[in-house]
């Protein structure tokens, strides 16, 4: 299970760190990310970072997204049972999910910064 982001990281800083990490992942894709594993295409607008974390938690052996998982763990301040959103019915490749999560994160950052 990914460990928590260091306690001193405030939400705006953690969000910026997430954007940096996701940008690095999207730019560094020389080979298929996480062996083209598939994850649930969750509704980020409804479920936020907790839904993203839940979706990515199903991938256990991909070093490339470990830091993303750790940052998401720090940004998600709900228990798993509190995440109330309709269950997804579509799976997408991790690379596509990361791109979607990056766009969502940047939008949040620009609105809230």
């Amino acid at each position: 299970t990914p460990g928590p982001v260091r306690r001193s990281t405030s939400p705006p800083v953690a969000l910026r760190e997430l954007i940096e990490e996701l940008s690095n992942i999207t730019q560094d894709q020389k080979t298929s990310l996480c062996n083209s594993s598939m994850v649930w295409s969750v509704d980020l607008t409804a479920g936020g970072f907790c839904a993203a974390l839940e979706s990515l938690t199903n991938i256990s052996s991909c070093n490339a997204i470990h830091r993303t998982q750790r940052i998401l763990n720090g940004l998600c301040n709900q228990k798993a049972s509190d995440v109330a959103s309709s269950p997804p019915d579509t799976k997408i490749e991790v690379a596509q999910f990361i791109s979607k999560l990056l766009n969502y994160s940047k939008q949040l950052f620009r609105y809230g910064h």
């Epitope: 705006p12 910026r16 954007i19 940008s23 730019q27 940047k106 620009r110 609105y111 910064h113």
Partner: antibody
Framework: EVTLRESGPGLVKPTQTLTLTCTLY??????????VDWIRQPPGKGLEWLAH???????RYNPALKSRLTISKDTSKNQVVLKLTSVDPVDTATYYC???????????????WGQGTLVTVSS | DIQMTQSPSSLSASVGDRVTISCRAS??????LNWYQQKPGKAPKLLIF???KLHSGVPSRFSGSGSGTDYTLTISSLQPEDIATYYC?????????FGGGTKVEIK
């Protein structure tokens, strides 16, 4: 080629509203990740950031001037407009618009600037 | 707001000299530091973004370094066309803020 061009009244009377227009060439504010900032520079002094607007109409202002500033865009004309109300002689400055891009990291770096338009506030 | 302090406010150096300009932020800006060059009567131009990334078309004699609150712009070999005022700007936190500028002159 990316260029920006500011236009303004040149001279404004105190208490009036200053309206500045920035016309964009070589890029469109309807394109994802594009943004435009306004910055001003009083004669012989440094730079002060005023406001910016993103392609999806997210707007941010300098809190010191927020109550007097309004930024908007007209995508069809590829223009960004800045309004500054209740002007005072201390608002005399060269006003610049500049492009910022949020692809990848959001650096808030202004990569292309207009030539600037000098605005004098005087009765 | 984050305060940006540049030093020196002005300097005079000879052609070929190595020139360094310092910029200090009032708090950690996590490398979100940009440098601009402004020649008399002209608009500023982006030189370096995110501490050390050279903007396209900028000569390689310009470089940037630093972290946390302290950053430096270096001109490895000053050229006559480098006469200008240089500004740092933090992009970590809104409102965006600029340093007071460093005027570079040729001896």
């Amino acid at each position: 080629e990316v260029t920006l061009r500011e236009s303004g009244p040149g001279l404004v009377k105190p208490t009036q509203t200053l309206t500045l227009t920035c016309t964009l060439y070589g890029f469109s504010l309807s394109t994802s990740d594009m943004g435009v900032d306004w910055i001003r520079q009083p004669p012989g002094k440094g730079l002060e950031w005023l406001a910016h607007i993103w392609w999806d109409d997210v707007k941010r202002y300098n809190p010191a001037l927020k109550s007097r500033l309004t930024i908007s865009k007209d995508t069809s004309k590829n223009q960004v407009v800045l309004k500054l109300t209740s002007v005072d002689p201390v608002d005399t400055a060269t006003y610049y618009c500049a492009r910022t891009v949020s692809s990848g990291y959001i650096y808030y770096a202004m990569d292309y600037w207009g030539q600037g338009t000098l605005v004098t506030v005087s009765s | 707001d984050i305060q940006m302090t540049q030093s020196p406010s002005s300097l005079s150096a000879s052609v070929g000299d190595r020139v360094t300009i310092s910029c200090r932020a009032s708090q950690d800006i996590r490398n979100y530091l940009n440098w601009y060059q402004q020649k008399p009567g002209k608009a500023p131009k982006l030189l370096i973004f995110y501490t050390s990334k050279l903007h396209s078309g900028v000569p390689s004699r310009f470089s940037g370094s630093g972290s946390g609150t302290d950053y430096t712009l270096t001109i490895s070999s000053l050229q006559p066309e480098d006469i200008a005022t240089y500004y740092c700007q933090q992009g970590n936190t809104l409102p965006l803020t600029f340093g007071g500028g460093t005027k570079v002159e040729i001896k």
